[in-house]
């Protein structure tokens, strides 16, 4: 049954030129995770498939690294990286769970990490 919840890193900020880890965690379900898709708006960044492993979209290969775990590391951040990121968990038998992270890339060094929060 779709009893799961996704916990994400929430609203986060990072410095231009730096890196950031996007993390989601699915809990409260016994469903099998078959694949996690990481997307920015409508662009697919990366896939972590339980059988086939990681695939990074060619256009992001230079700046995206898999992990840690099912998370995603964004490197060499630019102001254009500001925006919404989604972790989409494909599971069986539950179906799809989606988590949202908002990343703000700042020019200065005042970037602070936001609090963790839950998405049902």
């Amino acid at each position: 049954m779709m009893t799961g919840t996704i916990e994400t890193t929430g609203n986060i900020s990072a410095e231009k030129g730096g890196s950031i880890i996007l993390q989601c965690h699915l809990s409260s379900t016994t469903a099998q995770v078959t694949q996690v898709n990481w997307e920015q708006q409508d662009q697919l960044l990366a896939i972590c498939n339980a059988d086939l492993g990681w695939h990074i979209s060619p256009s992001f290969k230079d700046r995206v690294a898999p992990g840690p775990g099912l998370g995603l590391t964004l490197q060499s951040l630019t102001v254009n990286d500001t925006g919404e990121y989604f972790c989409i968990y494909h599971t069986y038998p539950d179906g799809t769970y989606t988590g949202r992270i908002f990343l703000e890339v700042l020019e200065s060094s005042v970037a602070e990490h936001g609090a963790r929060f839950q998405i049902p």
């Epitope: 078959t34 086939l52 494909h90 038998p93 539950d94 179906g95 799809t96």
Partner: antibody
Framework: QLQLQESGPGLVKPSETLSLTCTVS??????????WGWIRQPPGKGLEWIGS???????WYNPSLKSRVTISVDTSKNQFSLKLSSVTAADTAVYYC???????????????WGQGTLVTVSS | DIQMTQSPSTLSASVGDRVTITCRAS??????LAWYQQKPGKAPKLLIY???SLESGVPSRFSGSGSGTEFTLTISSLQPDDFATYYC?????????FGGGTKVEIK
């Protein structure tokens, strides 16, 4: 328009292996949001879920048939297949392949079905 | 396994009638219930999902309700095209299981 088409022998002898293939057209079997399943229906009876598969090969089977069932996928041919071993007359049924679609918040649903193929187990 | 029990097994009705079919689950499945329509020699067609959500393209005379263990499918005004067999299916817990079917026939 997505279409699913079952193919395979219509007659199988007792104790042999039933083999069916489902060919998917009008869409990719390798989509992350879809799972692909087999359901059967004995003549004049209800529906029974046999099992399902993900494009990358993960499988889930009905425990009542698990010891005899193998479902596989061939993404290069946009096909998935069913093998049911040691068949008896009780396995005579119309076999359907179907797509299980995942939508956020709604679970997985059999939204597209093949037209079904009758398999008779008889000597 | 979760047992799905439908009633009645056969229902005789006339065009224009309001028809109600019941489905009971042997344990709670929350709202993870679907309804399918099947005509002779054809594959089942999805009508309702998540107990009460109407599948795209399905006429609004079909509606679903219920949660937990008791569910109903209602056809507000039976049309000639609606004479068929209807199945409920739980999709909350593996293995997926279906009800035994309700045949809606012409009175």
């Amino acid at each position: 328009q997505l279409q699913l088409q079952e193919s395979g022998p219509g007659l199988v002898k007792p104790s042999e292996t039933l083999s069916l293939t489902c060919t998917v057209s009008g869409g990719s079997i390798a989509s992350s949001v879809y799972y692909w399943g087999w359901i059967r229906q004995p003549p004049g009876k209800g529906l029974e879920w046999i099992g399902s598969i993900y494009y990358s090969g993960s499988t889930w089977y009905n425990p009542s048939l698990k010891s005899r069932v193998t479902i596989s996928v061939d993404t290069s041919k946009n096909q998935f297949s069913l093998k049911l071993s040691s068949v008896t007359a009780a396995d005579t049924a119309v076999y359907y392949c179907a797509r299980e679609a995942g939508r956020t918040g709604t679970g997985l649903l059999f939204d597209y079905w093949g037209q079904g193929t009758l398999v008779t187990v008889s000597s | 396994d979760i047992q799905m029990t439908q009633s009645p097994s056969t229902l005789s009705a006339s065009v224009g009638d309001r028809v109600t079919i019941t489905c009971r689950a042997s344990q709670s499945i929350s709202s993870w219930l679907a309804w399918y329509q099947q005509k002779p020699g054809k594959a089942p067609k999805l009508l309702i999902y998540k107990a009460s959500s109407l599948e795209s393209g399905v006429p609004s005379r079909f509606s679903g309700s219920g949660s937990g263990t008791e569910f109903t499918l209602t056809i507000s005004s039976l049309q000639p095209d609606d004479f068929a067999t209807y199945y409920c299916q739980q999709y909350g817990i593996l293995p997926r299981t279906f009800g035994g079917g309700t045949k809606v026939e012409i009175k």
